[in-house]
């Protein structure tokens, strides 16, 4: 009996009745038995077919076996209702090989030609099975040339078996205190060959409790006890289980933290598994009771371990623990049944004691000492010399523990010095100087350091000067020893001031004309203000309409007197304003050089002379009366004139100040 | 305006108990409105907090881990003042040691004693 | 619990900001005080609650306090403001907690 080529040699080929393509003979029989190496099968077919027609192939037959099989008895040329002749079919192998047999009987009717067929090995699909049938792989089936092989899904493994996929089910560890954990693939069928443990793990104190929901189906067996797969619950105190069937075990409450759940599958069956929902009790804290003025949060029916809550306080009340006040407050339920920290009080806010205000004084309206929230203060300023600024001075002790104005500021109020207050009232025009009264010239200040000069009160804590007056003292102004509140030069009885800084303006250059002559001196205490110390006001915008020519100004100062001395006594002279181009013109001849009146200065004094401001004045103010505000205004500053004072044809030149408010209030602003 | 005056020994030996009193005027030891402490000094420690003595309808005292084990804070309301022992005393314990008392209003140690240097030496 | 952490020194020129820090982990959570020695004086409180100011403090010393870390922070510093200065909180066993301190030095 010929054999098929042996492997790995191309398995393919022909075979044919003996004599073809002429007639066979009577009482033949011949085997051929075809190998296709393993994972492969072999494919037959005819292309030409003429055997003697029997019933049932009795007779004359081709048989295809595939090992104890038969595939297919053949014969005529047709088939019938009984016979099968192969026609355009191909034929397979069940395994690697097929045999072919072929007989004829004794005799034949006529002449038959036989059969002609092809063969070939090719490759078994093993992934695609019949229906009805298991399927090769659990998961992935992957043919290749000559078999195949087996994958799983993410989450399984490929047991030894090379078909069944495991599910990678252990070492799960649940650690929250409610949860769901079911069999793998829930609510569909479980995998086979498996083993799954599952842990619930929770803090010491909490007790597990299992809920088995919606459906349990695990495969079971009526006379033996889970022997198939089965679900088993242990904790360090005792074991359940173990659970199959379709009947849904009843809750399990541990009165553990700590739960093994093992659920352990065989290689067969078709059923959904299980589900279960667990939660946890501890035992409960006390009930919270918020303290007066709080509330507590969340609210709950009870608190167990690990649950917290935490106290608010209403608006304008805090919190305070034991001694201390609190920004939050939570506290934790621990496993003996206890908080961890004591209830917390709410207690009033208490904005505590008010800033004293300088110049000023403050007032408990709500009560004598009441600091406590919605208490109300009220700032005042000290009459007559000092006004509030900004705001009405009534403040609240808000939730935030501030006392805060109506407008919302929390910072005091400023008591600022009323400005321009004199006890002179203007009369007809004076000629000649005047001995100053108490409280005629409050904002004259006398300016020692090294010669004697003179300065305005701006303010509580600034002077304003002439530039060349404090120039040899701009890098040391602790030198200048400041005096105020007193007429007389010599007196013992002044109030002292010291500089903290000077400012001399950056357009003024010493020794080349008198351009610019202004500075500031700041202080380094706030002066206290009354009838003898008030400042001096800056013009206002609309000042200008108050000094224009012929209108009188008044300069006081102690300087050099008709009789050539300093003047013991604080003297002043009420002089008219001089037109501009008349002052201009009266110093451009010599000795003065041309330009030596500019626009920053203005002039004033008589044409005749015998008024004018004079050495020892310069930095004091010239100062008008606003009659819309009733208050002095520094118009000008003394800064230079003619050798000899007061002399006739010749004038009293003085710094513009309303040219310099932008520079003033700069300087002040800054420092 | 509450005044704390310190009173005490500046020289103890080691192994031996510190003992410090503050005598208080312009308030009250048993006030429900403040707390009484002790605060120590030293260049290698800086501030150091110790303890505490306060009243609210009863006596409660709150000490400094660092010193748990060997601090007593006392209050004397019939002298108006409180007093801390420290016992067993080492070098360590040297330091400028102030009575300070705190606001419960405000949490600060808004009144400080004179300071007392105590230095542990044999 | 561990100490609040300062830096050891900080400098200013008169008229200038000085800005001096506390940090702790959550520090923000707590009210911090801030607490102003001069040598051989005992310390005076110039800060409570982050940001509120003793009676008798000047304005220019002002207070914040949010997540790790508070600040004291003193505008148009003086030079009598030259100091070492200490922040110090309570934490949750109310127990009193200090900084190391830091030096402010006006140039």
């Known amino acids: 009996t010929p054999l098929g080529p042996k492997w790995p040699e191309p398995v393919f080929g022909r075979l044919a009745s003996p004599g073809f393509p002429g007639e066979y003979a009577n009482d033949q029989e011949r085997r051929w038995t075809l190998t296709a190496p393993p994972g492969y099968r072999l494919r037959l077919y005819f292309t030409h077919f003429d055997l003697e027609l029997s019933h049932l192939c009795e007779y004359d037959f081709v048989k295809l076996s595939s090992g104890a099989k038969v595939l297919a008895t053949l014969c005529g040329q047709e088939s019938t209702d009984t016979e099968r002749a192969p026609g355009k079919d191909t034929f397979y192998s069940l395994g690697s090989s097929l045999d072919i047999t072929f007989r004829s009987d004794y005799s034949n009717e006529k002449p038959f030609t036989g059969f002609e067929a092809f063969y070939a090995a090719e490759d078994i699909d093993e992934c695609q099975v019949a229906p009805g049938e298991a399927p090769t792989c659990d998961h992935h089936c992957h043919n290749h040339l000559g078999g195949f092989y087996c994958s799983c899904r993410a989450g399984y493994v490929l047991h030894r078996n090379k078909r069944t996929c495991s599910a990678l089910c252990s070492g799960q560890v649940f650690t929250q205190r409610s949860g769901e954990l079911s069999s793998p693939e829930y609510p569909r069928p479980y995998p086979k060959l498996s083993s799954c443990t599952y842990s619930i793990s929770l803090e010491e104190g909490f007790s597990v409790i299992l809920d088995f929901v919606e459906s349990f189906d695990v495969e079971t067996h009526p006379e033996t006890l889970c022997p198939y797969d089965f679900l088993k619950i242990q904790t360090d105190r005792e074991e359940h289980g173990p659970f199959c069937g379709k009947t849904l075990p009843h809750r399990i409450e541990t009165k553990s933290n700590t739960v093994t759940i093992t659920f352990v599958t065989d290689e067969s069956g078709d059923h959904t598994g299980w589900k279960i929902h667990y939660t946890s009790t501890a035992q409960p804290c006390p009930y919270p009771m918020a303290p007066p003025n709080g509330h507590v949060s969340p609210v709950q029916a009870k608190y167990i371990l690990k649950d917290s809550f935490s106290i608010f306080c209403e608006t304008g009340y805090e919190l305070l623990q034991g001694h201390l006040p609190l920004k939050s407050f939570t506290a934790v339920c621990q496993k003996d049944g206890s908080w961890d920290r004591p209830m917390p009080a709410c207690s009033i806010v208490d904005c505590g004691p008010p800033d004293d205000l300088p110049s000023g004084r403050v007032e408990y309206i709500t009560g004598p000492g009441v600091t406590t929230y919605k208490a109300v203060i009220q700032y005042s300023c000290e009459e007559t010399f000092y006004t509030m600024k900004v705001n009405d001075g009534k403040y609240v002790c808000e939730a935030d523990g501030f006392w805060t104005s109506s407008k919302g500021e929390k910072s005091l109020p400023v008591c600022e010095p009323v400005c321009g207050l004199s006890a002179r009232t203007t009369g007809g025009r004076i000629y000649g100087g005047q001995k100053a009264k108490p409280g005629d010239f409050p904002w004259q200040v006398l300016i020692l350091g090294g010669t004697t000069a003179a300065g305005a009160l701006l303010y509580d804590n600034w002077v304003l000067t002439a530039a060349h007056a404090v120039y040899e003292q701009k890098h040391d102004a602790s030198a200048l020893d400041i005096r105020m509140g007193t007429l007389k030069r010599l007196s013992p009885h002044y109030t002292q001031a010291w500089s903290e800084a000077v400012f001399i303006h950056e357009g003024y250059t010493h020794d080349a004309g008198f351009d610019n002559d202004i500075a500031l001196i700041k202080l380094n205490n706030k002066v206290v203000i009354n009838s003898n110390i008030t400042p001096i006001c800056l013009p206002r915008k609309e000042a200008e309409s108050f000094m224009r020519t012929d209108d009188i100004g008044t300069a006081s100062g102690w300087g050099l007197t008709q009789r050539g001395f300093l003047a013991r006594n604080l003297m002043y002279v009420d002089i008219p304003i001089v037109d501009h181009q008349k002052c201009t013109a009266a110093y451009e001849k010599p000795p003065y050089p041309r330009g030596s009146v500019t626009a920053n200065m203005l002039c004033a004094g008589l044409e005749s002379g015998g008024k004018d401001s004079c050495r020892g004045d310069s930095g004091g103010a010239l100062v008008f009366l606003d009659s819309e505000t009733e208050r002095w205004f520094v118009g000008g500053i003394v800064s230079w004139g003619s050798m000899n004072c007061g002399e006739a044809g010749q004038y009293g030149v003085y710094t513009k100040v309303i040219n310099y408010i932008p520079w003033i209030e700069n300087i002040i602003s800054d420092f | 305006e509450v005044q704390l005056q310190q009173s005490g020994p500046g020289l103890v030996k080691p192994s031996q108990t510190l003992s410090l009193t503050c005598a208080i005027s312009g308030d009250s030891v048993s006030s429900k409105r403040a707390a009484w402490d002790w605060i120590r000094q030293s260049p290698s420690r800086g501030l150091e907090w110790l303890g505490r003595?306060?009243?609210?309808?009863?006596?409660?005292?709150d000490y400094a881990i660092s010193v748990k084990s060997r601090i007593t804070i006392n209050a004397d309301t019939s002298r108006n003042q409180f007093s801390l022992q420290l016992n067993s005393v080492t070098p360590e314990d040297t330091a400028v040691y102030y009575c300070?008392?705190?606001?419960?209003?405000?949490?600060?140690?808004?009144?400080w004693g004179q300071g007392t240097l105590v230095t542990v030496s044999s | 619990q561990p100490g609040l952490t300062q830096p050891p020194s900080v400098s200013v020129s008169p008229g200038q900001t000085a800005r001096i820090t506390c940090s702790r982990d959550?520090?923000?959570?707590?009210?911090v005080s801030w607490y102003q020695q001069k040598p051989g004086q005992s310390p005076v409180v110039v800060m409570y609650k982050d940001n509120k100011r003793p009676s008798g403090i000047p304005e220019r010393f002002s207070g914040s306090n949010s997540g790790n870390t508070a600040t004291l922070t003193i505008s148009g510093t003086q030079a009598m403001d030259e100091a070492d200065y200490y922040c110090?909180?309570?934490?949750?066993?109310?127990?009193?907690?200090f900084g190391g301190g830091t030096k402010l030095t006006v140039l």
């Open positions: 300070v008392k705190s606001n419960s209003g405000t949490g600060a140690f808004d009144s």
């Open positions: 003595t306060y009243y609210r309808s009863k006596w409660f005292n």
């Open positions: 110090q909180a309570w934490d949750s066993s109310t127990a009193g907690v």
């Open positions: 959550k520090l923000g959570d707590k009210y």
